[in-house]
Interface confidence: low
C-alpha cells in the first residue's frame, strides 16, 4: 500500500488557446485530470487502473501552481494504491479549459481540452522527486513526481506491513526497510520475549516483563541458580532441586540425624575423651578419677578399699593413702609383723601359722573378707551388674546403676525400645540387641516409616519438546521445564513460529 | 490435543447475515489469540478478523471493518464472527485459527473451515 504523489509546479498557455488552437473566452480556466495506470509499452485508452484525481481550477492561461492547497485541491496531487507497487508506471496529465463551475466531464464543451500528454516507465519507491517538464505547440507543463509508502508499509514495494507497537504480541518500531527493531529490554522474531535480568539462569529463570527473573519451581535466588533442597532439610544442602545431601557429621532423610554428637554436643566432662558410636550415641573414656556416662561423677579412690588389714584410706589430690594399724606396714598396709600368738584375726577369724610362725593367714567367716577379716565382704566384686551397669554398695546391700536401655535389679532386662511406639504411620516394630528396627507399610519408608514415598509424577515422560521434568515430593506433580521456544503446563505449544503464511 | 471446530456456515442471499461459532478445545483458551480467516476458490488466504486474549482488542481487514463483529465466551471456549450485510465477494470458506502469539495476525493452528456462500 503507498501513493503516487504527483506535484504540479507551472503551467504556460501565453496565447490561451485550446488544444484545436481556438482561444479561450476570456481567458483558459484550467484544471487538470490525472489517471495513472499499468505500464504500457504505447499508452493506450482504457481504465486507469492505479487511479485518477482532478484538480480544482488552479489557474488562467499561464500560472505557478503553490505547494499547499490551492482552491480546495491538494499539491501534491495523491493518488494512493492498495497493492504492491509494481515498479512500472503509464501516467497520463490532461490540462482542461471550464467555462463554467461544473468541472464533470459531461458539462464541458467537447474540444475543452488544453493538452494532453502521456509518459511511461520505471519508477522505484522513494523520497525523492523525479522532476519532467512537457512541451507541446503552445504549452508546457513543469512537474514532479515520486511514489512513497502508505503509513505502516515498508520495503521496495511497499509491500511489507509493519506497525508499530508496545503491547502483549510484540514491543517493537519499525526499521525504513519493514523489519522490526525492538524496544529496549525485549528480543525475538517479534519482540515479544523479554530480556531477563543480567546473569538470571537460562534453564531454572524466566521472565515475564524485561529485567526481571522469575524461578521455576525448585529453584531461588536473584537470579534462580540456587536449588531448594527437600522441604524439612535441616542440616543439607543440593545440586539439583528438591535433594538433601548431608553437612558432615549428620544423616538420614533430612539430615537431621547426628552423627557427630561427640563434637556437637560435646557431651564428656572432666577431660574425657568421646567416641561417636552411632545416630546420637556416644561412649566416654574418663580420666583417672572420674566414672559417670559422662565422667560427670568424681571417684574418690578409696572407694576401691585399698588398704588391707584394717588399714584407713586417706583421699589425696594426687591419689591416696592408707594408715596402717599396729602390727602392719607397706603401701596397702600388706605386710604384717604380727603372729597368731597376737590374735590378728578380726570378727571371729580363725588363725593359722605359716613359715615356722615368721607369718600366719586368717580363716574368715561368711561376710568377711581381708587378711585379717577386717572387712565386709564387697558385694561388687563379683561384677554381678549385667550390661555395662556400674555396682553401687548400700549398706549392707548393693546396687546396679545401669546404662541407657537396659533395668532390673543386676541390669538384665532390656528396656524395650518399642515401649514408645517410635514407628510412624502403622509400621510394625522390632526390638534389636541394640536398638530397633521399623517395618513399614506400602507408601512408606525411612527409619522410623516418617517419609511417605514418593511416587515419580515424571515416569509417565508427562513433558513434550524435550522438556526437563521435575517431581516436586511434597505433592507428587511433576513441573516441566521448558526448552526455549516452547509454553504450555507440558511444554506443548510452540511459541514465534514464523507465520504460516502471508497476508 | 489442539481441536477447533467451525460451525454457522450456509447459503445467504446479499445483504443477509450469519454467525460462526469456532469452539476451542486442546489449550488454556483464554490465555490465547484466536481470529477468521478465509479462502475464496482460486484466491490467496485472506485474512478477516483477530481478537486478542488480555483484553479482547479486536482487528479487522479494511474489506469487513463496519460489517463483521468478532466477539469471544472465555466460558464457553468459543469464539463468535457476527457478519452482517454479507456481500457475493464475501464467498468463501471461513476458517477459524488459534495464534500462540507470534503476531496477530500470524496463525499456528486453524480448523477445517464453514462454507459461506452469498448469492442470489
Known amino acids: 500500500s503507498g501513493v503516487f504523489q504527483l506535484q504540479l509546479q507551472e503551467f504556460i498557455n501565453e496565447r490561451g488557446v485550446l488544444a484545436s488552437g481556438r482561444p479561450c473566452e476570456p481567458g483558459c480556466r484550467t484544471f487538470f485530470r490525472v489517471c495513472l495506470k499499468h505500464f504500457q509499452a504505447v499508452v493506450s485508452p482504457g481504465p486507469c487502473t492505479f487511479g485518477t484525481v482532478s484538480t480544482p481550477v488552479l489557474g488562467t492561461n499561464s500560472f505557478a501552481v503553490r505547494d499547499d492547497s490551492s482552491g480546495g485541491g491538494r499539491n501534491p496531487l495523491q493518488l494512493p494504491f492498495n497493492f504492491t507497487w509494481p515498479g512500472t508506471f503509464s501516467l497520463i496529465i490532461e490540462a482542461w479549459h471550464a467555462p463554467g463551475d461544473d468541472l464533470r466531464p459531461e458539462a464541458l464543451p467537447p474540444d475543452a481540452l488544453i493538452s494532453k500528454i502521456a509518459i511511461q516507465g520505471s519508477l522505484a519507491v522513494g523520497q525523492n522527486w523525479l522532476l519532467d517538464e512537457q512541451t507541446s505547440t503552445l504549452t508546457r507543463l513543469r512537474y514532479s513526481y515520486r511514489v512513497i509508502c502508505s503509513d505502516n508499509y515498508y520495503g521496495d514495494n511497499c509491500s511489507r506491513l509493519c506497525k508499530k507497537r508496545n503491547d502483549h504480541f510484540g514491543h517493537y518500531v519499525c526499521q525504513p526497510d519493514g523489519n522490526l527493531s525492538c524496544l529496549p529490554g525485549w528480543t525475538g522474531e517479534y519482540c515479544q520475549q523479554p530480556i531477563c535480568l543480567s546473569g538470571c539462569h537460562e534453564q531454572n529463570g524466566y521472565c515475564s516483563k524485561p529485567a526481571e527473573c522469575l524461578c521455576r519451581p525448585g529453584w531461588q535466588g536473584r537470579l534462580c541458580n540456587e536449588c531448594i533442597p527437600h522441604n524439612g532439610c535441616r542440616h543439607g544442602t543440593c545440586s539439583t532441586p528438591w535433594q538433601c545431601t548431608c553437612d558432615e557429621g549428620w544423616g538420614g532423610l533430612f539430615c537431621d540425624q547426628d552423627l557427630n554428637y561427640c563434637t556437637h554436643h560435646s557431651p564428656c566432662k572432666n577431660g574425657a575423651t568421646c567416641s561417636n558410636s552411632g545416630q546420637r550415641s556416644y561412649t566416654c573414656t574418663c580420666r583417672p578419677g572420674y566414672t559417670g556416662v559422662d565422667c560427670e561423677l568424681e571417684l574418690s579412690e578409696c572407694d576401691s578399699n585399698p588398704c588391707r588389714n584394717g588399714g584407713s584410706c586417706k583421699d589425696q589430690e594426687d591419689g591416696y593413702h592408707c594408715l596402717c594399724p599396729p602390727g602392719y606396714y607397706g603401701l596397702h598396709c600388706e605386710h604384717s609383723t604380727l603372729s597368731c600368738a597376737d590374735s590378728p584375726c578380726f570378727n571371729g577369724g580363725s588363725c593359722r601359722e605359716r613359715n615356722q610362725g615368721a607369718n600366719y593367714a586368717c580363716e574368715c567367716p561368711p561376710n568377711f573378707t581381708g587378711s585379717n577379716c577386717e572387712k565386709k565382704v564387697d558385694r561388687c566384686t563379683s561384677n554381678p551388674c549385667a550390661n555395662g551397669g556400674q555396682c553401687l554398695n548400700r549398706g549392707p546391700s548393693r546396687m546396679c546403676r545401669c546404662r541407657p536401655g537396659f533395668t532390673g535389679t543386676y541390669c538384665e532386662l532390656h528396656v524395650s525400645d518399642c515401649a514408645r511406639n517410635p514407628c510412624a504411620h502403622g509400621g510394625t516394630c522390632h526390638d534389636l540387641e541394640n536398638g530397633l528396627m521399623c517395618t513399614c507399610p506400602a507408601g512408606f519408608s525411612g527409619r522410623r516409616c516418617e517419609v511417605r514415598t514418593s511416587i515419580d509424577a515424571c515416569a509417565s515422560s508427562p513433558c513434550f519438546n524435550r522438556a526437563t521434568c521435575y517431581t516436586d515430593l511434597s505433592t507428587d506433580t511433576f513441573v516441566c521445564n521448558c526448552p526455549y521456544g516452547f509454553v504450555g503446563s507440558r511444554c506443548e505449544f510452540p511459541v514465534g513460529l514464523p507465520p504460516s503464511f502471508p497476508w | 490435543e489442539v481441536q477447533l471446530v467451525e460451525s454457522g456456515g450456509g447459503l445467504v442471499q446479499p445483504g443477509g447475515s450469519l454467525r460462526l461459532s469456532c469452539a476451542a478445545s486442546?489449550?488454556?483458551?483464554?490465555?490465547?489469540?484466536l481470529g477468521w480467516f478465509r479462502q475464496a476458490p482460486g484466491k490467496e488466504r485472506e485474512w478477516v478478523s483477530c481478537i486478542s486474549s488480555s483484553d479482547g482488542t479486536t482487528y479487522y481487514a479494511d474489506s469487513v471493518k463496519g460489517r463483521f463483529t468478532i466477539s469471544r465466551d472465555n466460558v464457553k471456549n468459543t469464539v463468535y464472527l457476527q457478519m452482517n450485510r454479507l456481500k457475493p465477494e464475501d464467498t468463501a470458506i471461513y476458517y477459524c485459527?488459534?495464534?500462540?502469539?507470534?503476531?496477530?495476525?500470524?496463525?499456528?493452528?486453524w480448523g477445517q473451515g464453514t462454507q459461506v456462500t452469498v448469492s442470489s
Open positions: 486442546g489449550f488454556t483458551f483464554e490465555n490465547y489469540a
Open positions: 485459527a488459534l495464534s500462540l502469539g507470534s503476531s496477530w495476525c500470524a496463525y499456528d493452528y
